[in-house]
Interface confidence: low
């Protein structure tokens, strides 16, 4: 099985024990590590952070001791902007320029492939996204002709039904991608006005959402139905939780909220907590399991957080094995307890290790 793990370059800027550089990663933990994110400047792939080149080097030296490890560079992301991607993909010249710029950039910096993180193609971009993938793959095949190892091509896709329907021609893009990471998290957010788990495995009786689509099982099943081969589908598992501020004394699933949860000490983003911050939060908190959804949540005071733990990730891995998927994807290594100092297990990357162990179990 594949274990595809994202690393985010901006994690270097977190304070103190939250700061994560690629040299802190475990070279034997994942089969693939994806560095997020690269930029596109003047239609050419480019660095984003001032020190990206240094960090690329740090990451790719991990392969010296584990030649089986593959590294990919992810281009795009939330801050890149969908319209910018649309501009490049929809214009033949821009697209060609971008595609041509990718192989030399990846080779120069020691990456084994490219991950496309267009978040998200609009309703009019579906065809352009397909064309971009098809032409990128053709370029990778051509570039590898002189006997080089062919560069890998993957894409991170939304798990939301509305986005899947409007953005992706699943059957077509699947033909050209080496694997597809489906982002089976962020199903529930503060916009709903109630508590709810952002990455439930199943819908469950507890789901107060207005639809039946907001769960991992539906998203995976839907992708398969649309023509994604199970052998290329990698299922996303988050090492972060989504938190809410409760608006009343109710604390269960579907309880009213006044907004996102208070920012974590290190990640400093309202409504989001890294797993290592959750381990801190759990001291003195009340933990519940949402039985039907097979995921936990915890409450403390007026704070509510839905997250994944070692038990829930094992359930998810069992599920992806039952579905005969290609493996698991983790967002993100730097949100796991990468130092092993927060979660009291004296183990670095406890969630990702639990996923790895479950994948390896017979």
């Amino acid at each position: 099985y594949k274990l595809v793990c994202y690393y985010t370059s901006w994690s270097q800027y977190r304070e103190g024990d939250g700061s994560c550089f690629p040299d802190a990663l475990d070279r034997f933990l994942c089969t693939h590590i994806i560095y997020s994110f690269a930029n596109i400047s003047n239609d050419h792939i480019d660095t984003w952070e001032w020190n990206d080149v240094t960090l690329y080097g740090m990451l790719n030296t991990l392969k010296n001791r584990n030649p089986n490890l593959k590294t990919l560079l992810s281009v795009g992301g939330w801050n890149f902007g969908s319209q910018r991607f649309s501009k490049i993909a929809s214009n033949t010249q821009s697209r060609r320029t971008f595609i041509k710029s990718v192989p030399p950039f990846l080779r120069t910096h020691g990456f084994d492939g490219l991950d496309l993180a267009w978040l998200y193609p609009g309703r009019r971009d579906k065809q352009h996204f397909t064309t971009l993938i098809k032409e990128m793959k053709a370029e990778f095949i051509k570039e590898a002709q002189p006997g080089k190892k062919q560069l890998l091509l993957s894409a991170a896709l939304s798990a939301g039904k509305v986005t899947i329907d409007s953005s992706y021609d699943i059957a077509k893009i699947s033909q050209h991608l080496d694997f597809i990471s489906i982002m089976t998290y962020d199903f529930h957010g503060a916009w709903r006005g109630t508590t709810g788990h952002h990455s439930p495995l199943f819908r469950g009786q507890e789901d107060a959402s207005p639809d039946r689509f907001s769960n991992t099982d539906y998203a995976v099943g839907y992708m398969l139905r649309l023509g994604a081969p199970a052998s290329k589908l990698v299922m996303g598992i988050p090492t972060f939780g989504r938190s809410f501020t409760l608006a009343s004394s109710e604390t269960g699933v579907g309880a009213p909220i006044s907004g996102p949860g208070i920012p974590g000490r290190f990640t400093k983003e309202a409504g989001t907590l890294a797993y290592y911050e959750i381990c801190d939060f759990l001291r003195g908190a009340t933990v519940h399991r949402i039985l039907g959804q097979q995921v936990p949540y915890a409450t403390k005071g007026n704070q509510w957080v839905g997250y994944d733990d070692q038990e829930s990730v094992k359930s998810k891995v069992q599920y992806l094995k039952d579905r005969q998927l290609a493996g698991a994807m983790v967002w993100a290594l730097d949100l796991d307890d990468f130092q092993g100092s927060f979660c009291g297990q004296d183990l670095r990357f406890p969630l990702t290790n639990a996923i790895k162990d479950a994948l390896a179990a017979t």
Partner: antibody, heavy 119, light 111 residues
Framework: QIQLVQSGPELKKPGETVKISCKAS????????MHWVKQTPGKGLKWMVW????????TYADDFKGRFAFSLETSASTAYLQINNLKNEDTATYFC????????????WGQGTLVTVSA | DIVLTQSPASLAVSLGQRATISCRAS??????????MHWYQQKPGQPPKLLIY???NLESGVPARFSGSGSGTDFTLNIHPVEEEDAATYYC?????????FGGGTKLEIK
């Protein structure tokens, strides 16, 4: 700050052509879609078109196919609405509006341009 | 096309009381996680002003006395307590699919 400034009121005769403008400032014009909305006197609002500001490609509501032309001058961060062969029922205030984000409603509006068609 | 029907067409509410405006869609405007319904306030001679986006999110700078709720086909805008300056016409609008459409409007009068 972000502003959409529209051209002034127009008085036209039936059969004539009018072209109104919407100049955007305070943001990168090609980063956000632009829309036009029609409001007839004392009546409600009617969505007319969505324009991809990067490609210039318009997507029309059925009622606004034919006599209506939408264009962009990207270098001037300006969107245009042209109505050909004007009819009395085109008398209305036309607003340009910018999407807040993906599908999140129109947070920025032009002040509106009143087009009066009268013989 | 999705038709949005607002009710009532007009209402008069006393200062400090609650105003409730409904918007019914001819088919669901909700999808995975989002309800693509927005509410606007319009005063004479002015463009509409976004109050609530994605059914329940308060636009920045809009007073907390405005709130939105609903999913699927039924949505509500509540104003409580109503103030003098709230006299205006209110519109719902969906962005679920093209063409985007507006409701017919509700005129709010303050007694």
């Amino acid at each position: 700050q972000i502003q959409l400034v529209q051209s002034g009121p127009e008085l036209k005769k039936p059969g004539e052509t009018v072209k109104i403008s919407c100049k955007a400032s305070g943001y990168t014009f090609t980063d956000y879609s632009m829309h036009w909305v029609k409001q007839t006197p004392g009546k409600g609002l009617k969505w007319m078109v969505w324009i991809n500001t990067e490609t210039g490609e318009p997507t029309y509501a059925d009622d606004f196919k034919g006599r209506f032309a939408f264009s962009l001058e990207t270098s001037a961060s300006t969107a245009y609405l042209q109505i050909n062969n004007l009819k009395n029922e085109d008398t209305a205030t036309y607003f340009c509006a910018r999407e807040y984000g993906n599908y999140e409603g129109f947070v920025y509006w032009g002040q509106g341009t009143l087009v009066t068609v009268s013989a | 096309d999705i038709v949005l029907t607002q009710s009532p067409a007009s209402l008069a509410v006393s200062l400090g009381q609650r105003a409730t405006i409904s918007c019914r869609a001819s088919k669901s405007v909700s999808t995975s996680g989002y309800s693509y319904m927005h509410w606007y306030q319009q005063k004479p001679g002015q463009p509409p002003k976004l109050l609530i986006y994605l059914a329940s999110n308060l636009e920045s700078g809009v007073p907390a006395r405005f709130s939105g709720s609903g999913s699927g086909t039924d949505f509500t805008l509540n104003i409580h307590p109503v103030e003098e300056e709230d006299a205006a016409t209110y519109y719902c609008q969906h962005s679920r699919e093209l063409p985007w459409t507006f409701g017919g409007g509700t005129k709010l009068e303050i007694k």
